[in-house]
């Protein structure tokens, strides 16, 4: 006899990285017929939804109008059908960005390299932080973590055309509070024609569309849970 229902899916719209004072909606998708959903923050009850009519609703939304460091952290949700509760969802790490300062991102030997060259990114922030994050813009939000007193280095090793794209970095004050994003650095990797044509390049964005990137990146993936890429989320843990 089944003692618990399958776990629901949890995600953030438009993105799990939320600039401070901006709004975000945490979505929880369970089953039709669920009479109650509970959202938990850092292990404690945060909000409750009792959808009506339950038989016509399988997803609820918890709105956060004003993102700040107190709202940043780990969320999970559960739902109930009759008296039977579900397993808890995976953890959603909600991150507040645009805190305090802006780091500087540089790349060595330079932004234009040949396939096979060793490339290292450097992220520098003079204020009190020791953790840095390097993100490649695109649908899968590749995230790398680095450490250093005022600067972290991110060696990519010998690059291929798959490394092409636009990069930004953040200083991290804790796992869920990040700095403003750095200015973008576009890495151009040249190789032979065959490699270039086969390279799985992520979509990139002009320098002034970082806000749009935050609003659009992974939204489609978050709604299609079979494709959801947990790379960034897992790196936060």
């Amino acid at each position: 006899q089944q003692q618990t229902l399958p776990k629901p899916f949890i995600w953030a719209e438009p993105h799990f990285m939320v600039p401070k004072e901006k709004q975000v909606t945490i979505c929880c998708q369970g089953n039709y017929g669920a009479v109650e959903y509970q959202l938990h923050f850092e292990g404690s009850l945060f909000a409750v939804d009792r959808p009506k009519p339950p038989e016509r609703i399988n997803k609820v939304q918890f709105y956060i109008p004003d993102m700040n460091s107190r709202m940043a952290g780990q969320y999970s949700c559960i739902y109930r059908v009759g008296e039977l509760w579900s397993e808890p969802s995976n953890l959603l790490d909600l991150v507040v960005t645009e805190m305090y300062d802006t780091p500087t991102l540089s790349v060595h030997p330079g932004p234009e390299v040949i396939s096979g060259e060793k490339v290292t990114f450097y992220c520098r922030l003079d204020t009190a932080t020791s953790m840095f994050l390097l993100l490649k813009e695109g649908r899968s939000s590749h995230v790398q973590r680095g450490y250093g007193k005022v600067q972290a280095e991110f060696p990519l090793g010998p690059v291929t055309t798959a490394h092409r794209g636009t990069y930004r970095c953040f200083g991290s004050y804790n796992n869920h509070a990040w700095s403003f994003p750095s200015e973008p650095v576009k890495l151009l990797v040249t190789g032979d024609i065959e490699n270039t044509s086969l390279a799985p390049e992520d979509p990139t964005f002009p320098a002034d569309t970082w806000g749009t990137y935050l609003l659009t990146t992974e939204t489609g993936l978050q709604k299609d849970h079979a494709l959801w890429d947990h790379t960034a989320q897992n790196l936060l843990r």
Partner: nanobody, 130 residues
């Protein structure tokens, strides 16, 4: 400027009843989830009850379930907490609170965490004693 003003507190004997009111001005009250919290002397603030903006969902702390009833009148911009079968351990300052932001809240959602609330009243003291 947002203002939340509680009233209705006072001294009551164990087993008695009180009705607290919370009048809200400066916000579009009718689309905002509301909550009641309390803080007893020397203790942390704790959740008491919450209500969705449509009144379709209410939620209570286990300690008050079956004794307290939260309600609201959107036409009067007022939320209420009806407290029956009061006990000595209900003695506390009671605060009403409203969530922040715009009008995008689901009609059936309530918030139980104090951190979810942006605006707070000054509190009204409820003393249960014989």
């Amino acid at each position: 400027e947002v203002q939340l003003v509680e009233s209705g507190g006072g001294l009551v004997q164990p087993g008695g009843s009180l009705r607290l009111s919370c009048a809200v001005s400066g916000r579009t009250f009718s689309r905002l989830p509301m909550g009641w919290f309390r803080q007893a002397p020397g203790k942390d603030r704790e959740f008491v009850a919450a209500i969705s903006w449509s009144s379709s969902t209410t939620y209570y702390a286990d300690s008050v379930k079956g004794r307290f009833t939260i309600s609201r009148d959107n036409s009067k911009n007022t939320a209420y907490l009806q407290m029956n079968s009061l006990r000595a351990e209900d003695t506390a300052v009671y605060y009403c609170a409203a969530v922040g932001g715009s009008l995008d809240y689901s009609a059936t959602v309530v918030y139980t965490a104090a951190r979810a609330y942006a605006d707070w009243g000054q509190g009204t003291l409820v003393t249960v004693s014989s």
